[in-house]
């Protein structure tokens, strides 16, 4: 189970208006369901059941963009319509550049992630869990732009930085 | 590098209605947030409106409810529908490309040449 070092990058209002940016580090796990990969772009949450909708008039983003997922627990949703892999695969299929799973709440998601695939995704699949999914969704939470660089080496940074 | 050009400035009287749009061209990749910066004369220029790529916006509470910002990734192009125009809304008019640079862990700005509105009372 490799380490994934996720940089996301918060863009807020300053007093004056303009733009701001807030660096928050955090680690997750490359799953075996993506690739290895290097990635990055805007955040876009999205709810489990969102990817059920198979749509194909639904508007595909033009960008590459990370699909943040929180999944539910399993008792909340006893027969998903898609598996946890399946949920992947829709986001990619949808434009994802990559997608983070938090697993807090399922973590026998992480089994079935990293099951392997004949045909794993070409884009990297993510799990955070723990303090790690709380600071992420946090920030996703803020519905604000905030970005994602995923990377398979540390970040050269230090985690936290306020651009004033 | 990234490539601005606004058009779409001009003379308009109180309570009219201009809009500008600004083509990128470049290493689109960065353009993480284009945006539309003025700057009035003896003033600092001031961010009018910005826009990310999934559209989540950002307005100066001078315009909100008055000027509206879009894009069109596909274009690599954003708009600025000014409505209600003010005589303080007149400045130069600048489109930027807001990036993020993560080596250095500071955002960097590309800046277009700038186009004057003028609103006449």
């Known amino acids: 189970k490799e380490t994934a070092f996720v940089e996301v990058v918060l863009f807020e209002s300053s007093p004056s208006g303009d733009y701001t940016t807030h660096t928050t580090g955090l680690t997750g796990r490359f799953s075996r369901a993506g690739a290895m990969l290097s990635a990055e772009g805007e955040i876009v949450q999205m709810h489990p059941l969102g990817l059920c909708n198979n749509n194909d008039e639904e508007d595909l983003y033009e960008y590459g963009w990370v699909g943040v997922v929180k999944l539910e627990q399993p008792e909340l949703d006893p027969k998903p319509c898609l598996t946890v892999l399946g949920k992947a695969k829709r986001a990619v299929q949808r434009g994802a550049t990559a997608v983070i799973f938090d697993v807090s709440e399922n973590p026998e998601a992480i089994d079935q992630l990293n099951q392997g695939s004949e045909d794993p995704l070409k884009r990297p699949v993510v799990y955070v869990k723990g303090a790690d999914a709380i600071k992420l969704m946090n920030i996703v939470n803020k519905q604000k732009v905030a970005r994602a660089r995923i990377q398979h080496l540390p970040p050269r940074q230090p985690t936290e930085y306020f651009d004033m | 590098q990234v490539q601005l050009q606004e058009s779409g400035g001009g003379l308009v009287q109180a309570g009219g209605s201009l809009r500008l749009s600004c083509a990128a061209s470049?290493?689109?990749?960065?353009?993480?947030?284009m945006g539309w910066y003025r700057q009035a004369p003896g003033k600092e220029r001031e961010l009018v409106a910005g826009?990310?790529?999934?559209?989540?916006?950002n307005y100066a509470d001078s315009v909100k409810g008055r000027f509206t910002i879009s894009r069109d990734n596909a274009k690599n192009t954003v708009y600025l529908q000014m409505n209600s125009l003010k005589p303080e809304d007149t400045a130069v008019y600048y489109c930027?490309?807001?990036?993020?640079?993560?080596?250095?862990?500071?955002?960097?700005?590309?800046w277009g040449q700038g186009t004057q509105v003028t609103v006449s009372s």
């Open positions: 470049g290493t689109i990749s960065y353009a993480h947030i």
């Open positions: 826009i990310s790529q999934g559209s989540i916006t």
């Open positions: 930027a490309v807001i990036s993020y640079d993560y080596i250095k862990s500071v955002p960097f700005r590309y």
